[in-house]
Interface confidence: low
């Protein structure tokens, strides 16, 4: 079958690194400087990305394989293959169109991207506050007092706030 | 009572993906964040990313950022971890394990799925 | 990352004595820290969250103890059920990491 395809179609033969040359017989060229192509048959190498500015390189462009970027320190990417970089906030802030706020009281972030969640609201499964929340941390939920016989304890406090996402930092 | 119940060992080559199964029961699927955590034979356990069913809410490790795909079916109380692009070094037992919240710990787990990774 | 340093790597000890492993953050934790126990060839089990906090149906000679960087977990008279690997895990940040272990056999 392979062989009988490449008869058929001669790019099929040239393998990722390289494109199809329709200007010189079909014959497989290097991709130029400066650009990639990842897949074996290809027409056209594509132009490889310029980390630039807030970006920075964290993998170069090889024939084969296209730039990858991150952000400088005190940004973090957003979106699929890092395309924005956004402020770092402190943790117990958040980012909003006027830079970076504290958190309400009642909320926390424990990263340095994301949003200010609520803390743990451990009363509505009839659990105590072991440990009170702050700008930057949950509050710790303990034992209900039913629950404190010797050598036992829940660890399951109700309502649970959002894990704030990971910073690639 | 809580059950985490995983799907069954795999056996791969080098290059392909695998996706582990966990389905949970005895608690409400969607108020907790199921989390995936291997451990190589021999070695320590490793945390891969987890996900809240409730909206779906991913969180990985760098590490297995560009391999890893965690995602959650709230119809049937499942989530799943699918790896890709594996490796012999990806041989390794697959766990599921529960947490509430972020700081609290993982108190149930999966019994463990078996991915052996070979040419 | 925060990295969790664990010691010693494993320990031979008498039924009846007093065991102690040791867990170091690379950083601050505050009191953001849990402890499995993982018998051969089993799950990994719940033993301690919240540094000293025991989890439902665990020995009371199990304890947990610490705060920021250096944490302790001390079995006061080891039990021939207790020969296991010990973890540590910090809660504190994303992403969650564990120490490498603690191997505990019986002399």
């Known amino acids: 079958f392979e062989r009988t395809r490449s008869l058929q179609d001669p790019c099929s033969n040239c393998p990722a690194g390289t494109f199809c040359d329709n200007n010189r017989n079909q014959i497989c060229s290097p991709c130029p400087p400066n650009s990639f192509s990842s897949a074996g048959g290809q027409r056209t190498c594509d132009i490889c990305r310029q980390c630039k500015g807030v970006f920075r390189t964290r993998k170069e462009c090889s024939s084969t394989s296209n730039a990858e970027c991150d952000c400088t320190p005190g940004f973090h990417c957003l979106g699929a293959g890092c395309s924005m970089c956004e402020q770092d906030c402190k943790q117990g802030q958040e980012l909003t169109k006027k830079g970076c706020k504290d958190c309400c009281f009642g909320t926390f972030n424990d990263q340095k991207r994301g949003i200010c969640r609520p803390w743990t609201n451990c009363s509505l499964d009839g659990k105590s506050v072991l440990v009170n929340g702050t700008k930057e941390r949950d509050v710790v939920c303990g034992p209900s007092p039913a629950d404190l016989s010797p050598g036992a304890s829940s660890v399951t406090p109700p309502a649970p706030a959002r894990e704030p996402g990971h910073s690639p930092q | 009572q809580v059950q985490l119940v995983q799907s069954g060992a795999e056996v791969k080559k080098p290059g392909s993906s695998v996706k582990v199964s966990c389905k949970a029961s005895g608690y409400t699927f969607t108020s907790y964040w199921i989390n995936w955590v291997r451990q190589a034979p021999g070695q320590g356990l490793e945390w891969m990313g987890n996900?809240?069913?409730?909206?779906?809410?991913?969180n990985y490790n760098q590490k297995f950022k560009d391999r890893v795909t965690i995602t959650a079916d709230k119809s049937t109380s499942t989530a799943y971890m699918e790896l890709s692009s594996l490796r012999s070094e990806d041989t390794a037992v697959y766990y599921c394990?529960?947490?509430?919240?972020?700081?609290?710990?993982?108190?149930?787990w999966g019994q463990g799925t078996t991915v052996t990774v070979s040419s | 990352d925060i990295q969790m340093t664990q010691s010693p790597s494993s320990l031979s000890a008498s039924v009846g004595d007093r065991v102690t492993i040791t867990c170091r953050a690379s950083?601050?934790?505050?009191?953001?820290l849990n402890w499995y126990q993982q018998k051969p060839g089993k799950v990994p089990k719940l033993l301690i969250y919240?540094?000293?906090r025991l989890h439902s149906g665990v020995p009371s000679r199990f304890s947990g103890s610490g705060s920021g960087t250096d944490f302790t977990l001390t079995i006061s008279s080891l039990q021939p059920e207790d020969v296991a690997t010990y973890y540590c895990q910090q809660g504190h940040t994303l992403p969650r990491t564990f120490g490498g272990g603690t191997k505990v056999e019986i002399k």
């Open positions: 919240h540094t000293s």
């Open positions: 394990a529960r947490l509430y919240y972020g700081s609290s710990p993982f108190d149930y």
């Open positions: 996900i809240y069913p409730s909206d779906s809410y991913t």
């Open positions: 950083q601050d934790i505050s009191n953001y």
